[in-house]
Interface confidence: low
Amino acid sequence: QPLPTTGTPGSEGGTVKNYETAVQFCWNHYKDQMDPIEKDWCDWAMISRPYSTLRDCLEHFAELFDLGFPNPLAERIIFETHQIHFANCSLVQPTFSDPPEDVRGSHHHHHH
């Protein structure tokens, strides 16, 4: 199910108290960037910056809280955006070296 889009970046004084709260902040920021460009969700040129920012945000806070990255919660966020934003995309980026290569409807991109 989609993550809630309400909430604040942190608790008292704006400080992020835990990783769950931080992830929610990352997601809210990402949604703020993605919602206005819904018609371009399958255009990598348009969504590359918010997508990369989301990953950077999740990774930054993971390091801040001394967690590995990706961790299960971060992975759920990534998977969530595939389900919500990229489920109807059919085009696949050709290179394995870019994060968006896995942005496709089936979510699967491994080759034997």
Epitope: E20, A62, L67, P72, F79, D98, E101, H110, H111
Partner: antibody
Framework: QSVEESGGDLVKPEGSLTLTCTAS?????????ICWVRQTPGKGLEWIGC????????PYYASWAKGRFTISKTSSTTVTLQMTSLTAADTAAYFC????????????WGPGTLVTVSS | DGVMTQTPSSVSAAVGSTVTISCQAS????????LSWYQQKPGQPPKLLIY???SLASGVPSRFKGSGSGTQFTLTISDLECADAATYYC???????????????FGGGTEVVVK
Amino acid sequence: QSVEESGGDLVKPEGSLTLTCTASGFSFSISYWICWVRQTPGKGLEWIGCIYGGSSGRPYYASWAKGRFTISKTSSTTVTLQMTSLTAADTAAYFCATTAYGGYGYGTWGPGTLVTVSS
Amino acid sequence: DGVMTQTPSSVSAAVGSTVTISCQASQSVFSNNYLSWYQQKPGQPPKLLIYTASSLASGVPSRFKGSGSGTQFTLTISDLECADAATYYCQCTYGKSGTDTYLNAFGGGTEVVVK
């Protein structure tokens, strides 16, 4: 896009060995987990551990592997598995496998490399 | 670490029939669906069939179907073919949100013999 293991050998009990997983046609650096799995002769698959290919990635290990096994990313296309204090029970085919996100399963596997521990 | 209990350990079935393999996790898998199924033939590495419990991997026939959630999962192979003779493994990912626990486990395997 493929991966291949190397370094399998005959080693004496209590010895050490380092296996290498090398990627061809792609880089581990972004969005990839690189995992090690072993299979003893005629037996099932056993998960050893994984490491994230990104700069901040840390390894995760099965509880039985902690201490004796070390997974390291040595370059954007190579990951190693260091094994110490080997016993006959460690005799197995060792596979390197990759996945972009944990839930997606290991979509790419190497052919495996054989490690034999015997005196 | 979590434990995956796979049943049966072996099954024999006729061409054209249906085979069902079960996999039970000792605790809920991550996101309730981080469960994959693999097919392995002698001398070969495993081949991914199903991921996230029910998604079909690229190039895998729709005769293979995965289902389940949480701790109980099933692989169903319908219209069994001779080429389906192999050992099948389930594999899950455990993890607690926001922690560095990230563990995987394989089931013991199920040998499918096609008559």
